[in-house]
Amino acid sequence: GELETSDVVTVVLGQDAKLPCFYRGDSGEQVGQVAWARVDAGEGAQELALLHSKYGLHVSPAYEGRVEQPPPPRNPLDGSVLLRNAVQADEGEYECRVSTFPAGSFQARLRLRVLVPPLPSLNPGPALEEGQGLTLAASCTAEGSPAPSVTWDTEVKGTTSSRSFKHSRSAAVTSEFHLVPSRSMNGQPLTCVVSHPGLLQDQRITHILHVSFLAEASVRGLEDQNLWHIGREGAMLKCLSEGQPPPSYNWTRLDGPLPSGVRVDGDTLGFPPLTTEHSGIYVCHVSNEFSSRDSQVTVDVLDPQEDSGKQVDLVSAS
């Protein structure tokens, strides 16, 4: 007869490990007992369990409550056992010794491998601002056994660097993603992808990029100068900019206070029916936590009774 087992049994942390040991005997042969022991190199054998043809299953005190026989039906030549709720410390070499009649004793060894799936974490880097050089966008760390693979999935152009730390029974892998921040990256996903044999599918953690910037400011509303004449209703100036975080707007008049009746509504300056009092230099001030911008325009309200044309100067400053 001969023993059938596996060279390696692989389980995920917390699962039950079936340790196979089957005696393929000739007809008339009987198995008296199957003794299981842990036999790691450099350490004495530690008894696990005994499957006895008459006495049944005995579990050694160190494994009490953790070793069982597979559920029925059972073949009397099958000496396999279940090790419940595998932990990392269970990883190692195991031996089954089968005592048969009349053929004598046989033994076989297997290695139990316990996979520890990683629990990845993603940590964003410092605040990203347009104009910075190469900057850390995020780092992703995953620890497991064996060492997990950490990669990045993104449309954003950048560079990655990885390092790993080996522990006694696991390894931690950290990957960093660096980029040169630009406003086009704002709102783009940056996804850390962790692969491991103990995972049914890759684990993904997504970080949305936020790049602080503030665009140049400009003012719209004076495109048709002839519309700015005395008595006109509904005239308005709109300040144009964009930024992250979204900017706030403030309107002032360079040559004095805002005329009465002029309404400030965020980025828009609304005028009552125009009079010559509304002529002047208006400044739009745009700011966010990152920067600030100014744009100024000169409004010249025309008197239709005058023949002279209106002149408008547009000046932008930052």
Partner: antibody, heavy 126, light 107 residues
Framework: EVQLVESGGGLVQPGGSLRLSCAAS????????MSWVRQAPGKGLEWVSG????????NYADSVKGRFTISRDNSKNTLYLQMNSLRAEDTAVYYC???????????????????WGQGTLVTVSS | DIQMTQSPSSLSASVGDRVTITCRAS??????LAWYQQKPGKAPKLLIY???SLQSGVPSRFSGSGSGTDFTLTISSLQPEDFATYYC?????????FGQGTKVEIK
């Protein structure tokens, strides 16, 4: 025919010592695990100590741990029990017994006692 | 330690009676259980091992059953020589422990 013959019992004062012997014959002594079991007058059976074939696995009842020592000499086919610091509650008939040999090379398990000696009386009294 | 509880502690029966003695373990012991017979002034004698296996030379009127925690010794037809004290013993853990005994007396 399997025979186990105990000797060495007797009267001893509290705190004293005795050494019990058990001479085995009729079987290959070195192939079997052995045990000592005692029975106080009018009481039930109490397992005292056991020793595996090669002396590798030795166990004691908590009541005698640190005071009694089991040993064997396979060349003389003899089992021993050295009893020190004896107490009145150690008074009993001490039996030497052979363990049934149907479990091999597994020290965590002891087996049934298939042959017993006639016993030797140990009396601890002042 | 595993506690072994026998019942009854004593019983009176007549020759030819069917006698049943039970033994309960404080935790599961598979079939690591033996039954012994002891007569006054004599050493115990192994009757049953592995809960239900008859020791060589023991009459077939003795039988054992059970596994886990509950076990039974049955004498199918009591004979005069069967009047004695009977002990169960677990050997699943060290120390092996005995029940307190059941004395079978003549009615």
């Amino acid at each position: 025919e399997v025979q186990l013959v105990e000797s060495g019992g007797g009267l001893v004062q509290p705190g004293g010592s005795l050494r019990l012997s058990c001479a085995a014959s009729g079987f290959i002594f070195s192939d079997f695990d052995m045990s000592w079991v005692r029975q106080a007058p009018g009481k039930g059976l109490e397992w005292v100590s056991g020793i595996k074939q090669s002396s590798a696995g030795i166990n004691y009842a908590d009541s005698v741990k640190g005071r009694f020592t089991i040993s064997r000499d396979n060349s003389k086919n003899t089992l021993y029990l050295q009893m020190n610091s004896l107490r009145a509650e150690d008074t009993a008939v001490y039996y030497c017994a052979r363990e049934y040999s149907d479990v091999v090379d597994y020290v965590s398990v002891r087996t049934p006692l298939d042959y017993w000696g006639q016993g030797t009386l140990v009396t601890v009294s002042s | 330690d595993i506690q072994m509880t026998q019942s009854p502690s004593s019983l009176s029966a007549s020759v030819g009676d069917r006698v049943t003695i039970t033994c309960r373990a404080s935790q599961g012991i598979s079939s690591y259980l033996a039954w012994y017979q002891q007569k006054p002034g004599k050493a115990p004698k192994l009757l049953i091992y592995a809960a239900s296996s008859l020791q060589s030379g023991v009459p077939s009127r003795f039988s054992g059953s059970g596994s886990g925690t509950d076990f039974t010794l049955t004498i199918s037809s009591l004979q005069p020589e069967d009047f004695a004290t009977y002990y169960c013993q677990q050997h699943y853990t060290t120390p092996p422990t005995f029940g307190q005994g059941t004395k079978v007396e003549i009615k």
